[in-house]
Interface confidence: low
């Protein structure tokens, strides 16, 4: 069965200054490739977290993404402010050359 990306929470309400937990799980380890979190959609979407690389000072992962069989890609965003409001997407990429290819979005 083809991999599905599941974001079970349709909305998350967080008080200013608190931490938001955004849940995301994949139903399969195949295809191989990283997960990225975005706010908004389209080419101008804002990258919130990239499993592969980058510097995301307010983001921590709920589980250890380095573990080979991990399928939990949930993240926590600290010190929430009104500027963080928006729709967040958990996106699975398929490993490719030279660039990874977007495979499926939550």
């Amino acid at each position: 069965e083809e991999l599905q990306v599941i974001q079970p929470d349709k909305s998350v309400l967080v008080a200013a200054g608190e931490t938001a937990t955004l849940r995301c799980t994949a139903t399969s380890l195949i295809p191989v490739g990283p997960i990225q979190w975005f706010r908004g959609a389209g080419p101008g979407r804002e990258l919130i977290y990239n499993q592969k690389e980058g510097h995301f000072p307010r983001v921590t992962t709920v589980s250890d993404l380095t573990k080979r069989n991990n399928m939990d890609f949930s993240i926590r965003i600290g010190n929430i402010t009104p500027a963080d409001a928006g729709t967040y997407y958990c996106v699975k990429f398929r490993k490719g050359s030279p660039d990874d290819v977007e495979f499926k979005s939550g």
């Epitope: 908004g40 080419p43 101008g44 919130i48 995301f56 500027a83 928006g86």
Partner: antibody, heavy 125, light 113 residues
């Protein structure tokens, strides 16, 4: 009036450090992503760094990665660029620029719609 | 990175005549979901910071005179000044907004003949 004013430029020796500041006024600073863009003497524009409205996402050009640090203080309506290990090739006018779009969540969706006048950084021995 | 190539490097046009600047991207900047091209044009006059003229390849920024127009799609774009005025003497830059990092063209200098 929407305005960005840079400061902190100057003459510094190779290997030295500088901290640039950009003071914003006339708009809701905390709603906008911000950028630093530089222009070497007689040359074109080079994007340097980006910071999202809430500081959750930061990008750097490969040429400055590991040496420059972008930050912001929304309470003070200010953007900063800490520049370490400066090189001669960092000599340029540094502009802060607003990423248009506000709450659109798309940092470059309208281009960079407000620019400061720039501050000059000269790296020379 | 997406490479932006502008032509010509410089352009001399008589007052009141048309000026045309070209910009080519190394890959398409057209986003099929909304049919928008993520390309902007900037004007930089001597001693001044850049000014956003056009975004989405063809949408004029507020306050920009209608003699400035943008066209093109995919990888090939054009900025046209329909009737050159003395105050249009400047360097013009294109910039792609489609992928990080946002990259600029090398610039086209417009002068009066």
């Amino acid at each position: 009036e929407v305005q960005l004013v840079e400061s902190g430029g100057g003459l510094v020796q190779p290997g030295g450090s500088l901290r640039l500041s950009c003071a914003a006024s006339g708009f809701t600073f905390s709603s906008y992503s911000m950028n630093w863009v530089r222009q070497a003497p007689g040359k074109g524009l080079e994007w340097v760094s980006y910071i999202s409205s809430s500081s959750s996402t930061i990008y750097y050009a490969d040429s400055v990665k590991g040496r420059f640090t972008i930050s912001r203080d929304n309470a003070k309506n200010s953007l900063y660029l800490q520049m370490n290990s400066l090189r001669a090739e960092d000599t340029a006018v540094y502009y802060c620029a607003r990423g248009g779009g506000g709450y659109s969540y798309s940092p470059y969706i309208y281009g960079m719609d407000v620019w400061g006048q720039g501050t000059t950084v000269t790296v020379s021995s | 990175d997406i490479v932006m190539t502008q032509s010509p490097d410089s352009l001399a046009v008589s007052l009141g005549e048309r000026a045309t600047i070209n910009c080519k991207s190394s890959q398409s900047v057209l986003y099929s979901s909304n049919n928008k091209n993520y390309l902007a044009w900037y004007q930089q006059k001597p001693g001044q910071p850049p000014k956003l003229l056009i975004y989405w390849a063809s949408t004029r920024e507020s306050g920009v005179p209608d003699r400035f127009s943008g066209s093109g799609s995919g990888t090939d774009f054009t900025l046209t000044i329909s009737s050159l005025q003395a105050e249009d003497v400047a360097v013009y830059y294109c910039q792609q907004l489609y992928l990080y990092p946002p990259t600029f063209g090398g610039g086209t200098k417009v002068e009066i003949k």
